[in-house]
């Protein structure tokens, strides 16, 4: 399955939207800094089968969509930018879903190693726990926005490697 060029463009647009969403300076939130430990190992290695890489990317985007789709998120961010973000993420999910169905099942057998997906889920669980702990404060959301940008930047590297493999 070849990821369309539009997928890379969508990824770039998502990064731009996340940057535009910034409401306060991260420097004013230094006391709220937190190590969520993005599972970088899941994005660095070349041991990935294509099916696994696509599924991990899908999980990151799905979890990001879920995170910004909450009631608390709609209070924290500009609604117009949020709507654009939903559209971009939704399109990327569609692109990846088409590929997942082709890649994951071969001859009726799933080829997936679930470890990486679980690691990504735990990472987003830590983000949700942090927001709850910080009572969804503006600084907590800003820390999370910056963190999601970092995770998208890492997943972009995996996307590029996928494109080179095609």
């Amino acid at each position: 399955c070849d990821l369309p060029q539009t997928h890379s463009l969508g990824h770039r647009r998502t990064m731009m939207l996340l940057a535009q969403m910034r409401r306060i300076s991260l420097f004013s939130c230094l006391k709220d800094r937190h190590d969520f430990r993005f599972p970088q190992e899941e994005f660095d290695g070349n041991q990935f089968q294509k099916a696994e890489a696509i599924s991990v990317l899908h999980e990151v985007i799905q979890q990001t969509f879920n995170l910004f789709s909450t009631k608390d998120s709609s209070v924290a961010w500009d609604e117009r930018l949020l709507d654009k973000l939903y559209t971009e993420l939704y399109q990327q999910l569609n692109d990846l879903e088409a590929c997942v169905m082709q890649e994951v099942w071969v001859g009726g057998t799933p080829l997936m190693n679930e470890d990486s997906i679980l690691a990504v889920r735990k990472y987003f669980q830590r983000i949700t726990l942090y927001l709850t702990e910080k009572k969804y404060s503006p600084c907590a959301w800003e820390v999370v926005r910056a963190e999601i940008m970092r995770s998208f930047s890492s997943s972009r590297n995996l996307q590029e490697r996928l494109r080179r493999k095609e």
Partner: antibody, heavy 122, light 107 residues
Framework: EMQLMESGGGLVQPGGSLRLSCVAS????????MSWVRQAPGKGLEWVAS????????YYAPSVKGRFSISRDNSNNTLYVQMNSLGVEDTAFYYC???????????????WGQGTLVIVST | DIRVTQSPSSLSASVGDRVSISCQTS??????LNWYQQRPGKGPQLLIS???TLQSGVPSRFSGSGSGTDFILTIISLQPEDSASYYC?????????FGQGTKVEIK
Amino acid sequence: EMQLMESGGGLVQPGGSLRLSCVASGFTFKSFAMSWVRQAPGKGLEWVASVGSQGGSKYYAPSVKGRFSISRDNSNNTLYVQMNSLGVEDTAFYYCVKETDAVATMDALDMWGQGTLVIVST
Amino acid sequence: DIRVTQSPSSLSASVGDRVSISCQTSQSVNIYLNWYQQRPGKGPQLLISAASTLQSGVPSRFSGSGSGTDFILTIISLQPEDSASYYCQQGYITPYTFGQGTKVEIK
């Protein structure tokens, strides 16, 4: 009865290599992440590495990254750690440990082996 | 990496005493703080997971409390077999980190 049995420890020269093994029994090995934790004689505990239930999601302590490699064979219920470029600071009891979840983080180390001693010395 | 600070490093108490060991982390670990007991010459054993969940087979005189960055292990009525080293460990993120340990001796 749940059990973890380490083997492969011994005396090795600085710069040398060693491979430790751990055979698990009494639980569904393939369902849980596994770790290695070490303890220098008379000192505290130091986590070394972890591997996910299916052999993915490998994590390492900064002190061993690039030198140690963790792996597992679910068909034989066995956990391994390949240790290269060993230094005197790697001298310790090495414990094989079961985690409470399928991948590392947000869990606990709920079952420990008896440990195997690795001595790095000239 | 998350730093884990445990205190005291050692304590001596009498049978029946109430004993508390403190553990602090350099950032919030939510509830993902575990406590281990290590008797001399043995491997560690998990006593309490997720700050306050007592493991099966562990006597009810042991209890854990706390969340975020501050945690406490309490032994309500110290028994001779509790003579051991106790370690706290954050299981929130890797690298997992342990406290320096607390050696508990019976007077």
